[in-house]
């Protein structure tokens, strides 16, 4: 049974040109975590494997960074970048957990961080 | 198994910069997050920065902003860290760390820096 | 940034004694590491993702915890455990450590 829940940073917002950090933490599980992906609707950004660390997708090499810890760094945002971004937590014995983030990319400057790690 | 072979000790003339150096080996050294944290005797241990090698992305924590800069050769497989405007409170011992987003699990052993006035 | 505090600096353990240490965080965070470092030496990762053993660590080590609030436990301490403990944290910018649990032998 899948008894883990995934927290993520839920929706946020990031001013255009700026950068903006991606997290989520699987929690209420003793699973051990083989790998994390990290998508963007259907493309995928990273992958960070137990064994052999992290895989940046060579389209997204100069704009995407590990980190911090299973994080992922997303820089020199656009517009373009507003949209629903997943990470994949791949687990044995329990299987796939998917967690969701919104983040939005605006022009001005208003831009307000949600809240860390709220349930989405 | 992965290795970090760090530079020896160093003893710096206050005011000057220092280079250190960590050699990795044993893994690909473009996969993995290279940390370094300093170690003194009354403060613990206090996270610096780290570099992605795969890109040279940097991550540094704002109390060492403009007085260390990381840096990557990836021919080479080496890490640096320089360290610069050298005063009494700079010495200390620097380790660097690996980290593929499980902490870090493979340690240098240590770069000591004495800094004489 | 957030602040870790480790309940003693310093701890005394009997062989065969249980041994429970904390680390407090200033805000909440999603995950605690843990350092074992003797003296002279590097660091070594002991205990990441707030329970989970690094490799080689013996099953008689545990960690647990939410929040703010961790711990990692020894269930029955043995000479060769006697050494610093440090907890860290990156659920925020920048990561920091704790100034560490130096755990002695009785």
């Known amino acids: 049974m899948m008894t883990g829940t995934i927290e993520t940073t839920g929706n946020i917002s990031a001013e255009k040109g700026g950068s903006i950090i991606l997290q989520c933490h699987l929690s209420s599980t003793t699973a051990q975590v083989t790998q994390v992906n990290w998508e963007q609707q259907d493309q995928l950004l990273a992958i960070c494997n137990a064994d052999l660390g992290w895989h940046i997708s060579p389209s997204f090499k100069d704009r995407v960074a590990p980190g911090p810890g299973l994080g992922l760094t997303l820089q020199s945002l656009t517009v373009n970048d507003t949209g629903e971004y997943f990470c994949i937590y791949h687990t044995y014995p329990d299987g796939t957990y998917t967690g969701r983030i919104f983040l939005e990319v605006l022009e001005s400057s208003v831009a307000e961080h949600g809240a860390r790690f709220q349930i989405p | 198994q992965a290795y970090l072979q760090q530079s020896g000790a160093e003893l710096v003339r206050s005011g000057a910069s220092v280079k250190m150096s960590c050699k990795a080996s044993g893994y690909t050294f473009t996969s993995y997050n290279l940390h370094w944290v300093k170690q003194t005797p009354g403060q613990g241990l206090k996270w610096i920065g780290y570099?992605?090698?795969?890109?040279?992305?940097?991550n540094y924590n704002q109390k060492f902003k403009g007085k260390a800069t990381l840096t990557a050769d990836t021919s080479s497989s080496t890490a640096y860290m320089q360290i610069n405007s050298l005063t009494s409170e700079d010495s200390a011992v620097y380790f660097c760390a690996r980290e593929g987003g499980w902490a870090m699990d493979y340690w240098g052993q240590g770069t000591s820096v004495t800094v004489s006035s | 940034q957030i602040v870790l505090t480790q309940s003693s600096a310093i701890m005394s353990a009997s062989p065969g004694e249980k041994v429970t240490m904390t680390c407090s965080a200033t805000?909440?965070?999603?995950?605690m590491h843990w350092y074992q470092q003797k003296s002279g030496t590097s660091p070594k990762r002991w205990i990441y993702d707030t329970s989970k053993l690094a490799s080689g660590v013996p099953a008689r080590f545990s960690g647990s915890g939410s929040g703010t609030s961790y711990s990692l436990t020894i269930s029955s301490m043995e000479a060769e455990d006697a050494a610093t403990y440090y907890c860290q944290q990156w659920s925020s910018n920048p990561s920091t450590f704790g100034a560490g649990t130096k755990l002695e032998l009785k």
């Open positions: 570099i992605y090698p795969g890109n040279g992305y940097t």
């Open positions: 805000s909440s965070v999603s995950s």
